[in-house]
C-alpha cells in the first residue's frame, strides 16, 4: 500500500531550524528572513509500528532526496545518521526499524523517539550550529522538543 506522507519543517523549542551540514548531517541554528529557505523540508511518512496510545510511528525523509534519518549503533552508542536509500523502494509502509521514530505529541510539541532504541530522542544542543543527534536524556540540557510547520506540497 502506498504510504501516506506530508511535507514539513521542524524547529526545536528554542526556534532553531534544521539545515544540511555536509551530505549526511543536519545541524540546528537560528535562521531569519531569506535564510529560512535553507532549512530542510522533511517528508514525514506514517508507517507501521508498535501499537501505542500516544506514539505515532513515522519515518523522516528529506523531501525529494533519497535520504532518511536512521538510528544505528556506532561504537556501541545509538547514533543518528542520514542514510541513503533506493528511491524506487522508499518510502514504504513497513520501514525497517532503524528508520522509525515514535512521534509523541503534547500541546503541539513533538518528540521523536527512536523505535530501535527506546528512550533515545532526536536532539539538538543549546549551542548554535551543532549537529542534530540522538540523545539518551530528556529534560536535561539538550533539546528534544520540536514544533512542526506544514509546507505546501
Amino acid at each position: 500500500a502506498p504510504v501516506r506522507s506530508l511535507n514539513c519543517t521542524l524547529r526545536d523549542s528554542q526556534q532553531k531550524s534544521l539545515v544540511m551540514s555536509g551530505p549526511y548531517e543536519l545541524k540546528a541554528l537560528h535562521l531569519q528572513g531569506q535564510d529560512m529557505e535553507q532549512q530542510v523540508v522533511f517528508s514525514m511518512s506514517f508507517v507501521q509500528g508498535e501499537e501505542s496510545n500516544d506514539k505515532i510511528p513515522v519515518a523522516l525523509g528529506l523531501k525529494e532526496k533519497n535520504l532518511y534519518l536512521s538510528c544505528v549503533l556506532k561504537d556501541d552508542k545509538p547514533t543518528l545518521q542520514l542514510e541513503s536509500v533506493d528511491p524506487k523502494n522508499y518510502p514504504k509502509k513497513k520501514m525497517e526499524k532503524r528508520f522509525v521514530f515514535n512521534k509523541i505529541e503534547i500541546n503541539n510539541k513533538l518528540e521523536f523517539e527512536s523505535a530501535q532504541f527506546p528512550n533515545w530522542y532526536i536532539s539538538t544542543s543549546q549551542a548554535e550550529n551543532m549537529p542534530v543527534f540522538l540523545g539518551g536524556t530528556k529534560g536535561g540540557q539538550d533539546i528534544t522538543d520540536f514544533t512542526m510547520q506544514f509546507v505546501s506540497s
Partner: antibody
Framework: QVQLVQSGAEVKKPGASVKVSCKVS????????IEWVRQAPGKGLEWIGE????????NYNEKFKGKATITADTSTDTAYMELSSLRSEDTAVYYC?????????????WGQGTLVTVSS | DIQMTQSPSSLSASVGDRVTITCKAS??????LSWFQQKPGKAPKSLIY???RLVDGVPSRFSGSASGTDYTLTISSLQPEDFATYYC?????????FGQGTKLEIK
C-alpha cells in the same frame, strides 16, 4: 468546542454545479484533514476525498475525480467541495468531517450535512 | 480498493442485550478502523477509532476489538438510545471505505 457548520440545502438542475462549504471552529484548522463523505437517500456512506489545509495536500477517491473539487481557505477556516456536471444520482447528503493530520484519531467530528438535490 | 464486509446487515435486540457487529477487511488495514453510529436524519457520530479507542464522551458499554482482519464492535448492555445504524470505516488506504451498515432494531 469543535464545530463544523455546513452550508444549507441546495436544489440544482442536471448539468449545473454546486459548492458546499464547511466552516470549522474550536481547533487549529491547518492541522486536521477535512474529509468529505456522501450518503445517497437510504444508502450507506461513501468517501469522496480529503484536504489538509496546512499544506494543501488533497487525496481523492478515483471515483470522484472530475466530479468533486476540494479546496480550503485558511483565512476563514472554511473548506469547500464543488460538484460539477450534476446528475440525478448525485442527489445525496454531503458531510464534512475531521481527522488529525497524523491519521490517529479517526473521523472524530462531523458537520450536520448538506442535502444536494438534482432535479429537472 | 479494500472491501469492508459488515455483518449482520440488520439485527433485532432488546434493551439490556449484548450485541456484536463485525467488519471483515479484505486486507490488512494496520488497525486504522473506526466505528460510527447514525440515527435517521442525523450525521454519523464517531464512537471508536484505531480499533478500540473510545471517542471522548462515548459510554464505556461500547468497545472494539480485532482478530487478524476481523474487527468487532460490542455493545455490552443495549440502551434505548443505541438503536441506530452502525458503520465501520477503514482509513488505512485510499480510497477509504465504509462497511455497508448494520441496522440495529428493537425486538
Amino acid at each position: 468546542q469543535v464545530q463544523l457548520v455546513q452550508s444549507g440545502a441546495e436544489v440544482k438542475k442536471p448539468g449545473a454545479s454546486v459548492k458546499v462549504s464547511c466552516k470549522v471552529s474550536g481547533y487549529t484548522f491547518s492541522r486536521y484533514w477535512i474529509e468529505w463523505v456522501r450518503q445517497a437517500p437510504g444508502k450507506g456512506l461513501e468517501w469522496i476525498g480529503e484536504i489538509l489545509p496546512g499544506d494543501g495536500n488533497i487525496n481523492y477517491n478515483e471515483k470522484f475525480k472530475g466530479k468533486a473539487t476540494i479546496t480550503a481557505d485558511t483565512s476563514t477556516d472554511t473548506a469547500y467541495m464543488e460538484l460539477s456536471s450534476l446528475r440525478s444520482e448525485d442527489t445525496a447528503v454531503y458531510y464534512c468531517s475531521t481527522i488529525y493530520y497524523d491519521y490517529d484519531q479517526g473521523f472524530t467530528y462531523w458537520g450536520q450535512g448538506t442535502l444536494v438535490t438534482v432535479s429537472s | 480498493d479494500i472491501q469492508m464486509t459488515q455483518s449482520p446487515s440488520s439485527l433485532s435486540a432488546s434493551v439490556g442485550d449484548r450485541v456484536t457487529i463485525t467488519c471483515k477487511a479484505s486486507q490488512d488495514i494496520d488497525r486504522y478502523l473506526s466505528w460510527f453510529q447514525q440515527k435517521p436524519g442525523k450525521a454519523p457520530k464517531s464512537l471508536i477509532y484505531r480499533v478500540k479507542r473510545l471517542v471522548d464522551g462515548v459510554p464505556s458499554r461500547f468497545s472494539g476489538s480485532a482478530s487478524g482482519t476481523d474487527y468487532t464492535l460490542t455493545i455490552s448492555s443495549l440502551q434505548p438510545e443505541d438503536f441506530a445504524t452502525y458503520y465501520c470505516l477503514q482509513y488505512d488506504e485510499f480510497p477509504y471505505t465504509f462497511g455497508q451498515g448494520t441496522k440495529l432494531e428493537i425486538k
